[in-house]
């Protein structure tokens, strides 16, 4: 099993990690859904965006998110490995000028309007932990992942190896 200390050892210095270049290595639009195939949707309410996790009606269009992928370099002394490693970080933007942010104090995931360069709270380390699912780990808070709680996105602390493949932090990306 994936020892959480392994993740934290590798990502302890995420806050100081250097993202290679300012431009993403690739970008594309995809819909985001949970392991249980609920859709992540975004609604404008009172001039701010709310994020929901819900079952869509048949033929209802899925919201798309622009995923921007960045390479991050990590020195070997942080990873515990013998050589420098690379990680893939992602930012998620469901609409122009708005990005998903990790609010570590409130343990919440929020949409904030901001300009580039984006703050560290907008970057997430991308993991393939389970089959064709991905997980998003906070750059600013190693061991904390975007997850689903009470039909909303929240930040979930993963404190043991058994929880790293838990369904509520697994997401599917689809371009259709």
């Amino acid at each position: 099993a994936f020892g959480i200390s392994g993740v934290q050892k590798y990502t302890r210095a995420l806050h100081d990690s250097s993202i290679t270049g300012i431009s993403p290595i690739t970008e594309y639009l995809a819909s985001l859904s949970t392991y249980n195939d609920q859709s992540i949707t975004f609604a404008l309410e009172d001039e701010s965006y709310e994020i929901y996790v819900e079952d869509l009606k048949k033929d209802e269009k899925k919201d798309k998110v622009l995923l921007s992928y960045y390479e991050s370099q990590h020195p070997s002394n942080e990873s515990g490995d013998g050589v420098d490693g690379k990680m893939l970080m992602v930012t998620l933007s469901p609409t122009k000028d708005f990005w998903l942010h990790a609010n570590n104090k409130e343990h919440s995931v929020e949409l904030h309007k901001c300009e580039k360069p984006l703050p560290d709270q907008a970057f997430f380390v991308l993991h393939n932990m389970h089959s064709n699912c991905v997980s998003f780990e906070c750059k600013t808070d190693p061991g904390v992942f975007i997850g689903v709680k009470d039909n909303h996105l929240a930040l979930i602390k993963v404190d043991s190896s058994e929880n790293l493949c838990t369904e509520n932090i697994l997401f599917k990306l689809s371009e259709t």
């Epitope: 099993a1 994936f2 020892g3 392994g6 993740v7 590798y10 290595i25 690739t26 594309y28 995809a30 992928y69 990590h74 990873s79 515990g80 490995d81 013998g82 050589v83 490693g85 690379k86 990680m87 893939l88 380390v125 991308l126 993991h127 393939n128 932990m129 389970h130 089959s131 064709n132 991905v134 190896s161 790293l164 493949c165 371009e175 259709t176």
Partner: antibody, heavy 121, light 107 residues
Framework: QVQLQESGPGLVKPSETLSLTCTVS????????VHWVRLPPGKGLEWLGV???????DYNSALMSRLTISKDNSKSQVSLKLSSVTAADTAVYYC???????????????WGQGTLVTVSS | DIQMTQSPSSLSASVGDRVTITCLAS??????LAWYQQKPGKSPKLLIY???RLADGVPSRFSGSGSGTDFTLTISSLQPEDFATYYC?????????FGQGTKVEIK
């Protein structure tokens, strides 16, 4: 530096189980996924499966019922077991490491030298 | 499973030629495609990842392009050491399938 080394018997009898070990150094199996790929004589590369940093495995659909990939993080070893082998399983078997920490999107820049396994009685 | 179709299956070219190999995915794979070079008796070598990114230590005469379902590997000026078999691999969804390979031979 990153190294991967495959080991195991070079000859396996039909209907038996092929067992190979990939011993790695220069990185931790808790940080990177490891893939198994084979090259049958006169054919192209065939992806067999992956064991991810988190410990879950995914397999080639055609081999799923016969294939098991597991690992021992503390020994830095990944094992492949392929049951009920036939002559069609004769190939050079490679293990390879993911480019990116805890994700497979970047392909595999690090490979073992490969080991030839012949299935014959 | 996602099928990867490479073309041509083989080609003959001369040193200095511009060589293009294409790879077609049976469904969208975004840009999660890798290209490998393999020589007889040797392990595969990663050339390109994420469709367009040059792997460490790979000469700049190699380049990759494409996204979605159509991808191309280009060798701008073929060198003697480039005669080998080239494979594409999709890493979008498991099982991570390879193309059938393109053998580049000396004309």
């Amino acid at each position: 530096q990153v190294q991967l080394q495959e080991s195991g018997p070079g000859l396996v009898k039909p209907s038996e189980t092929l067992s190979l070990t990939c011993t790695v150094s220069g990185f931790s199996l808790t940080n990177y996924g490891v893939h198994w790929v084979r090259l049958p004589p006169g054919k192209g590369l065939e992806w067999l499966g992956v064991i991810r940093a988190g410990g879950s495995s995914d397999y080639n659909s055609a081999l799923m019922s016969r294939l098991t990939i597991s690992k021992d993080n503390s020994k830095s070893q990944v094992s492949l077991k392929l049951s009920s082998v036939t002559a069609a399983d004769t190939a050079v078997y490679y293990c390879a490491r993911d480019h990116y920490f805890s994700n497979s999107y970047g392909g595999s820049p690090y490979w073992g030298q490969g080991t030839l396994v012949t299935v014959s009685s | 499973d996602i099928q990867m179709t490479q073309s041509p299956s083989s080609l003959s070219a001369s040193v200095g030629d511009r060589v293009t190999i294409t790879c077609l995915a049976s469904q969208t794979i975004a840009t999660w495609l890798a290209w490998y070079q393999q020589k007889p008796g040797k392990s595969p070598k990663l050339l390109i990842y994420a469709a367009t990114r040059l792997a460490d230590g790979v000469p700049s005469r190699f380049s990759g392009s494409g996204s979605g379902t159509d991808f191309t590997l280009t060798i701008s000026s073929l060198q003697p050491e480039d005669f080998a078999t080239y494979y594409c691999q999709q890493l979008y969804n498991t099982p991570y399938t390879f193309g059938q390979g393109t053998k580049v031979e000396i004309k």
